[in-house]
């Protein structure tokens, strides 16, 4: 999916609200320097592509992502302002439901989402100079 | 404006399945989630379950797992609720509930009139 | 899961009294994933209040909302007869999700 159409100031908004508040809470009790982000991007389409890919696709050691609350709650804003979005997540989807089992926050999946605070802090800067 | 139409009272037989219906109008139905939720005679409201229509992704209260099968159906913006081996415990009022965001934050923004399921032989 | 526990579950109040409803959370979750909902009889829940303070479109300024961490509330400044119903707390961060038992409160 080519994200240059999304209206970003919205999703950046649902970001703020809500969706740091439940990556935060998947968060607690770890350290903010325990994890190296090591993952990055260079605009809010690139960022919105990483986010997406981290969010919603399987990893080696961390399968159960897309059902945590901040997943939804980002499913729900790209599908609401990023158009045709939803249309083309049926197959992704398909191949989510086979590689998840259960929901266990693994230290692989806590790293995963440090990196994802991370992108998503990214795309709120989007005029940052890339380091 | 956005509605949700639900489907007509029930009366069903103990043992027996229902599938219940909301009808979407007024906003694109494919981009959000539908939840439903059930309220049994003079009790609160319990979340049953979400699916977003756009690939039928669901997510389960675990107490309503194979009870409550969620569905949609994108081509004419209607989810289902199907409720199966029914017993008295199942007698309530089912509502479905859109997932939206109002002034960016996250909640059920906007209910059917709700579907009331009578169990009973 | 995430418990709410909300009290009175029961209240009455006269015209122009004010009136407190809480909402105690079992974990701590972040303030802009409590709602509130009212309901009158026979008909569907309606939002009513969002992310613990926004007022939902259409309600009243009478009606406030405040808390953080375990702790919310809703509060009515002057008691008016169309605000007798029954409200819900509902919890929007983590599955599954959550609502109070609501509080009833009548006209007195």
């Known amino acids: 999916y080519d994200f240059t159409n999304c209206d970003f100031e919205k999703i950046k908004a649902a970001y703020l609200s809500t969706i740091s508040k439940d990556l935060i809470t998947y968060m607690s009790g770890t350290k903010s320097t325990e994890f190296n982000n090591t993952v990055s991007c260079s605009n809010r389409p690139h960022c919105l592509t990483e986010i997406q890919s981290l969010t919603f696709n399987p990893t080696a050691g961390c399968a159960s992502l897309a059902k945590e609350m901040f997943a939804m709650k980002t499913k729900a804003a790209l599908a609401i302002w990023c158009p045709g979005y939803s249309e083309t997540q049926i197959n992704a989807t398909q191949a989510m439901k086979k590689a998840r089992k259960s929901k266990v926050t693994t230290n692989k999946c806590l790293e995963q989402v440090s990196q994802l605070q991370g992108l998503w802090r990214r795309f709120n800067r989007p005029l940052l100079k890339q380091q | 404006q956005v509605q949700l139409q639900q489907s007509g009272a029930e009366l069903v037989r103990p043992g027996s399945s229902v599938k219940i219906s909301c009808k979407a109008s007024?906003?694109?139905?494919?981009?959000?989630?539908m939840n439903w939720v059930k309220q049994r005679p003079g009790q609160g409201l319990e979340w049953i379950g979400q699916?977003?229509?756009?690939?039928?992704?669901?997510n389960y209260n675990g107490k309503f797992k194979g009870k409550a099968t969620l569905t949609a159906d994108k081509s004419s913006s209607t989810a289902y609720m199907q409720l199966s081996s029914l017993t008295s415990e199942d007698s309530a009022v089912y509502f479905c509930a859109r997932g939206g965001y109002v002034n960016f934050l996250y909640a059920m923004d906007y209910w059917g009139q709700g579907t009331s399921v009578t169990v009973s032989s | 899961e995430i418990v709410l526990t909300q009290s009175p579950a029961l209240m009455a109040a006269s015209p122009g009294e004010k009136v407190t409803i809480t909402c105690s959370v079992s974990?701590?979750?972040?303030?802009?994933?409590l709602h509130w909902y009212q309901q009158k009889s026979e008909t569907s829940p309606k939002p009513w209040i969002y992310?613990?303070?926004t007022l939902a479109s259409g309600v009243p300024v009478r009606f406030s909302g405040s808390g953080s961490g375990t702790s919310y509330s809703l509060t009515i400044s002057s008691m008016e007869a169309e605000d007798a119903a029954t409200y819900y707390c509902?919890?929007?961060?983590?599955?599954?999700?959550?609502f109070g038992a609501g509080t009833k409160l009548e006209l007195k």
């Open positions: 974990s701590s979750i972040s303030s802009s994933n």
């Open positions: 509902q919890q929007w961060s983590s599955y599954p999700l959550t």
């Open positions: 007024g906003y694109a139905f494919s981009s959000y989630w």
């Open positions: 699916i977003f229509p756009g690939d039928g992704e669901t």
């Open positions: 992310g613990t303070s």
